[in-house]
């Protein structure tokens, strides 16, 4: 065991248990948890005579450390006298000493409640030149108390003559005031009112709170997720406005397109936050084709209290494209958790950073809440990577031991998806570690003309030609999904194969 200094505790009797005619009384000092031996215990008995006896050290079974008790028996006018027990442990250091000063007996007492109150700000939320802190020490059995003010743990030189004590029934209350300059208060220091009473310490601390009034409104505009864009085929963008002060004025969020074309109907949501600020979101459905072709969307935020409108814009990310690589792993069985396994998926070297990660089980997409996926981080090269983690249960892998991690990304060809299957028990599942590709999406052709529509751009289905389900699952000719283009004056489009 390594060197350990002792903890020291005074040992006293309850005053009510000492006979009033007792001519001598014994008190003690416990030194415990030290290593190695020895400790030296000495007593300061003031003007009284006393005899001391230090008991042999005992070993504490669990830790192998030692404990010892020193007893002091005094006679005479001991009732008003204070005694000090000094414990020295030279193995800790040559000058290691702990002093405990206490009286012969302890009275039953009600401890105080310590609470710091602070002076108010002015009406505009600004601090006055000086700030008053009031320490309320309340509800304790009358007796001597000492109040100390600390600044970041250091004792302050404070005039305590202003402290006033009042008694209500059998309990007493004391208050002490501390005046600080605005500069000290704003410096973010912590102020503590420390109360010593009956050998115990009670305290409360305070500091300047974080600004509750927002320093400024912020607005953010998101891009559609690749899942919404390429799979769900109903992309949306969201304008998020945060740190609004709740007030009578209305926040207006207006959408526009750089091309000047009309925008769809947006949905708006307001939420009051815990810090008292307001968050407003507006979600706008955008056309798949419009987004892919590079349309720019603008969100304009106006409010009576804003000096000028906030403008945010978003468009498809430019720059080089790279498809993601997907690797899926199952962690080995961990002792004590035989009925759970963690699956991990590394998706890397993709550009741009917009990516959606999905997990599938039993050929069904699992909820996003089931997995935890990191934000895209830059690789050492020019691409990005994410990790995704899915916890699975025995019931799931016994139902079907194949889980699929899928990345949806614009550069993934031909279907904007790359996926990898993984099994908890690969040997039993018939080796599913190989890459699994989704069936290719087939381009959308016109039912009335040959070749590809120009808008398809060679690799993207016509945005309003919704993928049917194919085969017997969809009305229409076998192996062919028919869907009608909604725009006027254009021929209907059909899929020339399975989705």
């Amino acid at each position: 065991a390594s060197t350990q200094s002792p903890s020291v505790f005074p040992l006293t009797r309850c005053c009510k248990n000492i006979p009033s005619n007792a001519t001598s009384v014994t008190l003690g000092c416990l030194a415990t948890g030290y290593f190695p031996e020895p400790v030296m215990v000495t007593w300061d008995t003031g003007s009284l005579n006393g005899t001391t006896m230090t008991l042999p050290a005992t070993t504490l079974t669990l830790s192998g450390h030692y404990a010892t008790i020193s007893l002091l028996t005094v006679s005479g006018a001991w009732a008003k006298q204070m005694f000090t027990c000094r414990v020295a442990h030279t193995p800790s250091s040559t000058d290691w000493v702990d002093n405990k000063t206490f009286s012969v007996c302890s009275r039953d007492f009600t401890p105080p409640t310590v609470k710091i109150l602070q002076s108010s700000c002015d009406g505009g939320g600004h601090f006055p030149p000086t700030i008053q802190l009031l320490c309320l020490v309340s509800g304790y059995t009358p007796g001597t108390i000492n109040i100390t003010w600390l600044e970041d743990g250091q004792v302050m030189d404070v005039d305590l003559s202003t402290a006033s004590t009042t008694q209500e029934g059998e309990l007493a209350s004391t208050q002490s005031e501390l005046t600080l300059s605005q500069k000290h208060w704003l410096s973010d220091r912590t102020y503590t009112c420390q109360v010593t009473y009956q050998g115990h310490t009670f305290e409360d601390s305070t500091k300047k709170c974080a600004d509750s009034n927002p320093r400024g409104v912020s607005a953010y505009l998101s891009r559609p997720s690749p899942f919404d864009l390429f799979i769900r085929k109903s992309p949306t963008i969201t304008c998020l406005v945060v740190d609004l002060a709740p007030s009578k004025g209305t926040v207006n969020l207006t959408w526009s397109r750089a091309s000047g074309k009309p925008v769809n109907h947006s949905t708006r949501k307001e939420e009051k936050q815990r810090n008292g600020t307001l968050t407003v979101t507006s979600t706008l459905p955008v056309g798949t084709r419009d987004w892919i072709e590079g349309e720019t969307y603008q969100c304009r935020v106006t409010h009576p209290h804003l000096p000028r409108a906030l403008m945010r814009s978003t468009t498809k990310t430019s720059g080089p494209r790279a498809a993601p690589e997907v690797y899926a792993f199952a962690t080995p069985e961990w002792p004590g958790s035989r009925d759970k396994r963690t699956l991990a998926c590394l998706i890397q070297n993709f550009m741009p950073e917009d990516i959606s990660v999905q997990w599938l089980h039993n050929e069904v997409q699992l909820p996003d809440a089931r997995h935890s996926t990191t934000q895209p981080r830059k690789t050492k090269g020019s691409g990005f990577f994410v990790f995704s983690r899915l916890e699975v249960t025995r019931a799931e892998w016994e139902q079907k031991d194949e889980f699929i991690c899928r990345a949806v990304h614009e550069a993934a060809s031909p279907s904007q998806t790359v996926q990898r299957a993984v099994s908890v028990n690969p040997g039993l599942a018939g080796g599913s570690a190989q890459s699994q590709r989704a069936p290719d999406r087939v381009l959308c052709h016109s039912g009335q003309q040959q070749g590809l529509p120009r808008a398809a751009g060679g690799s993207v289905p016509h945005p309003r030609c919704h993928c049917g389900a194919g085969r017997a699952d969809w009305p229409g000719p076998p192996e062919l999904d028919v869907c009608v283009e909604e725009a006027e004056g254009e021929a209907p489009w059909t899929w020339t194969g399975l989705c």
């Epitope: 050929e363 069904v364 069936p439 194919g470 399975l498």
Partner: nanobody, 118 residues
Framework: DVQLQESGGGLVQAGGSLRLSCAAS????????MSWYRQAPGKQRDMVAT???????AHADSVKGRFTISRDHAKNTVYLQMNSLKPEDTAVYYC?????????????WGQGTLVTVS
Amino acid sequence: DVQLQESGGGLVQAGGSLRLSCAASGFIVSDNVMSWYRQAPGKQRDMVATIMLNGDTAHADSVKGRFTISRDHAKNTVYLQMNSLKPEDTAVYYCNARDSMLEPGRGAWGQGTLVTVS
């Protein structure tokens, strides 16, 4: 784990109505393609109606105008409202969920609910 539970089947007279429910657990219905299939005794399983991720729906010619598929995101449930029922609609009705990238007939299935039209 992924589970589908159909309910709402029963015996009904011709011309009557029924509403089938398919309660999903372990996944979100609006993130997957949801379909109703039916299988009459001695026949193959046929698609009745499908609802895509974006909410688009399709119905087999034999039920168009009579059956309607819908979904409730909050209840994570898919419905099949069946009106003007005919004796030939008698079958076991199955709920199917599949990932949108998979071809039809794949995915997870419910146990089925029997609809008898007299």
